[in-house]
């Protein structure tokens, strides 16, 4: 017997859609082999309608898809806009149609409900609004109007024109009588519940001459959209609930056990701890739509998510909702990279950020996640030469090592740098990753003087002391600017005496500036690297002043000024945040602002990261 399993019978109605899940043993071969859905012919063959290799028959064009979920050992065939012509016998299978690794499925599509015996059918999604129209004749214009619901054998009054409202409908129903010209009254029920489904009867008048109209209300739970994203990647849930709930609190929740739905994030400021540092709720448009971005996807993030609107900011009966089933693919294309990077106060970190290697020309960004309100991520640096003003001289984004990874270096660390940072590009929005920077006890490994003053026209020598642990690393000096750090010639001056218990392998490497000019003023970094992989850095600010006395300056550690804790803040600023995730390429929003340089500032927060992989700030 075939190991493939699925539904033997599927019944639906015209215009509807079906989602057929076929289960297979998730062996390595099965996970990667061709999946197909075919229709059995009268003479025994099976004609492919859709396959995992991209084939879609003209009969299914624009209305069907096949998605493989290798981790689960399932694939799903979605078919929309069903017609009675779709009724028949099908197979879902693996490999080649004729080889027998398949399962037979019978699909029966019946005629959609219409106006059967004067019954008007209303099909409405859970949480939405229905308007039941009830015509009447002139002789009943002044008489009582009412709506009943059939409960078992008995009609139960729901609402009438004298002001009665059934307690089950309090606060969410009204009866409208149209102007005198129209012989029609309407009953509007909002925040529809599943329990509202059933047979209704409108009535105008109470005697034998009353006008009656039957209505069949069908309340549908929204079918979840299947979303399949890579481990360590990101997902965006776009939630459009309609303008009628534009001013109601919004939420995203995750169904935990059956009907419980735990709030992940809402517009009232609640956020689940497990999503700290890796979630943003982007603000509503005027039509009430919003989106939620989650980065650093984990295996345990998989599940059913609902977005909705309710004044409590959580799922309640009658909340309008949208649903997704998120699957997290563990066979991820996104490489592992450290989710925690540690540095010491005064020291530095070098963060490796993955990106889709097919998009090497994309703009790279690094932003700081902030937890205030719905979360935001102000940009700190990009690969086009922009650096947020208060990070000048201590932050650099380097395209190296390339081929799917860029590097961000942050030095002169203080405790305020602890927090969560996002790596992203203006290309593939699924490749957003999160890293947490932790500031730990300890001393920086590289020793440089504090801020240094050079004299115009003279020579300046600035030392950098490297401990023996970096003996095998390449040591360099460079001059920082917005686009990176330009390498400068430096001299190895032999072993350093700045380290206790450090042998001949320690090193003193000096930067020499001959005939200093005004252009030499600025930030200089000394650092270590191995090939294209960067390690620790230390920064020195060189100020240039007029000559006071002759000679050259050789700066030692002892003479150095104390380094300031942090540069003076400046308001020049770009951000990705709840109002300003405007660059659509950054955030899959399809709006458009290529470059937001807002005048604003924000505070920092800290976050939980995707795994326990850690990276020290000083080496790889």
């Amino acid at each position: 017997k075939s190991p493939i399993f699925g539904p033997e019978e599927v019944n639906s109605v015209e215009g509807n859609s079906v989602s057929i899940t076929c289960y297979y043993p998730p062996t390595s071969v099965n996970r990667h082999t061709r999946k197909y859905w075919c229709r059995q012919g009268a003479r025994g063959g099976c004609i492919t309608l859709i396959s995992s290799e991209g084939y879609v028959s003209s009969k299914y064009a624009g209305r069907a898809n096949l998605t493989n979920f290798p981790e689960n050992g399932t694939f799903v065939v979605n078919i929309a806009q069903l017609s009675q012509d779709d009724s028949g016998r099908y197979k879902c299978g693996l490999g080649i149609n004729s080889r027998g690794l398949s399962f037979d499925v019978s699909l029966e599509v019946s005629q959609g409900p219409g106006l059967l015996n004067d019954t008007k059918v209303y099909t409405v999604d859970l949480g939405r609004t229905v308007t039941i129209n009830c015509p009447f004749k002139t002789e009943n214009a002044q008489k009582r109007k009412s709506l009943y619901k059939q409960i078992g054998l008995y009609p139960v009054l729901v609402i009438d024109s004298s002001g009665y409202v059934n307690p089950n409908y309090t606060g969410r129903i009204r009866l409208d009588i149209q102007g005198t010209g129209q012989l029609l009254f309407s009953v509007v029920i909002n925040q529809l519940r599943l329990s509202d489904a059933g047979q209704y009867l409108c009535q105008a008048g109470d005697d034998s001459n009353s006008n009656k109209k039957n209505a069949d209300l069908q309340v549908l739970k929204p079918e979840p959209e299947l979303v399949y994203e890579d481990l360590r990647g990101s997902v965006t849930f776009h939630c459009a609930l309609g303008p009628e709930v534009a001013n109601v609190a919004k939420f995203l929740c995750r169904q935990s056990s059956g009907e419980n739905c735990d709030v992940v994030v809402n517009t009232l400021g609640k956020r689940a701890p497990a999503f700290e540092g890796r979630i943003l709720l982007n603000p509503q448009d005027k039509d009430g739509s919003f989106s939620v971005v989650i980065t650093g996807l984990r295996k345990e993030d998989a599940g059913r998510y609902l977005c909705g609107a309710h004044s409590d900011g959580q799922l309640q009966e009658g909340s309008p909702i949208q649903a997704w089933q998120l699957f997290v693919n563990e066979e991820s294309t996104i490489p592992r990279s450290p989710t925690v990077v540690k540095g010491v106060a005064g020291g530095s970190v070098a963060v490796l950020c993955p990106y889709n290697r097919k998009e090497s020309k994309s703009i790279k960004y690094w932003c700081l996640w902030e937890g205030a309100q719905n979360g935001r991520c102000p940009l700190l640096v990009d690969s086009e030469g922009w650096v947020k003003a208060q990070y000048e001289g201590r932050l650099s984004l380097l395209e190296e090592p390339g081929n799917g990874t860029f590097t961000v270096i942050l030095n002169q660390l203080t405790s305020r740098d602890a927090g969560f940072y996002w790596c992203l590009t203006n290309g593939d929005t699924l490749w957003r990753t999160t890293v947490e920077i932790k500031i730990i006890e300890g001393e920086p490994n590289l020793k440089v003087p504090g801020n240094v003053t050079a004299v115009l026209g003279e020579t300046l020598k600035v030392p950098c002391h490297f401990p023996c642990k970096f003996s095998s690393y390449e040591k360099y000096w460079c001059k920082w600017n917005n686009t990176g750090c330009q390498a400068l010639p430096s001299q190895d001056e032999g072993p350093s005496k700045a380290f206790v218990n450090c042998d001949e392998n320690s090193r003193l490497v000096s930067l020499t500036l001959n005939l200093v000019t005004r252009a030499d003023e600025g930030w200089y970094w000394c650092g270590v690297k191995q090939g294209h992989f960067y390690g620790e850095t230390a920064a020195v600010y060189v100020a240039v002043e007029e000559r006071k006395a002759a000679g050259s300056r050789d700066v030692s550690l002892a003479k150095a000024d104390a380094a300031p804790d942090e540069k003076v803040l400046d308001s020049g600023f770009r951000e990705i945040e709840n109002k300003a995730i405007q660059d659509p390429r950054l955030f899959a929003e399809e709006k458009a602002v290529a470059d937001t340089r807002d005048q604003a500032d924000g505070s920092r927060a800290s976050v939980d990261s995707g795994s326990s992989e850690e990276q020290g700030g000083s080496s790889r």
Partner: nanobody, 127 residues
């Protein structure tokens, strides 16, 4: 409190028919999936049949051992489940359990795909 109550079990002859019913009460939502499992003495609980509802579509699943003999049906709104069993065999003897879950996901053959369970009804098929 959620309760699933099975009925219709009994003692029948081989090749006879029997109809099992299950009524759910206390479910906060109408269920998205209901199923039948059975457990024979000294054996593990095994999947028999299931029905799933999503939107206005219905999906029916059967174990190989009952295909063509058993028919599952149900009413999502009324929270009821039926199992029409024909051409019964002695190996169908077991306690039959009704199960339900508010969600539609998960392999319907696995007990982990269901949250609520009934107490069971005994079916004995004598030869």
């Amino acid at each position: 409190e959620v309760q699933l109550v099975e009925s219709g079990g009994g003692v029948v002859q081989a090749e006879d028919s029997l109809r099992l019913s299950c009524a759910a009460s206390g479910l906060p939502f109408s269920s998205s999936r209901m199923g039948w499992f059975r457990q024979a003495p000294g054996k593990e609980r095994e999947f028999v049949a299931a029905i799933g509802w999503s939107g206005r579509s219905t999906y029916k699943y059967y174990a190989d051992s009952v295909k063509g003999r058993f028919t599952v049906s149900g009413d999502n709104a009324k929270k009821t489940l039926d199992l029409q069993m024909k051409d019964l065999k002695p190996e169908d003897t077991a306690v039959y359990y009704c199960a339900a879950h508010p969600d539609y996901y998960g392999d319907p053959r696995t007990s982990g795909a269901y949250r609520y369970w009934g107490q069971g009804t005994q079916v004995t098929v004598s030869s």
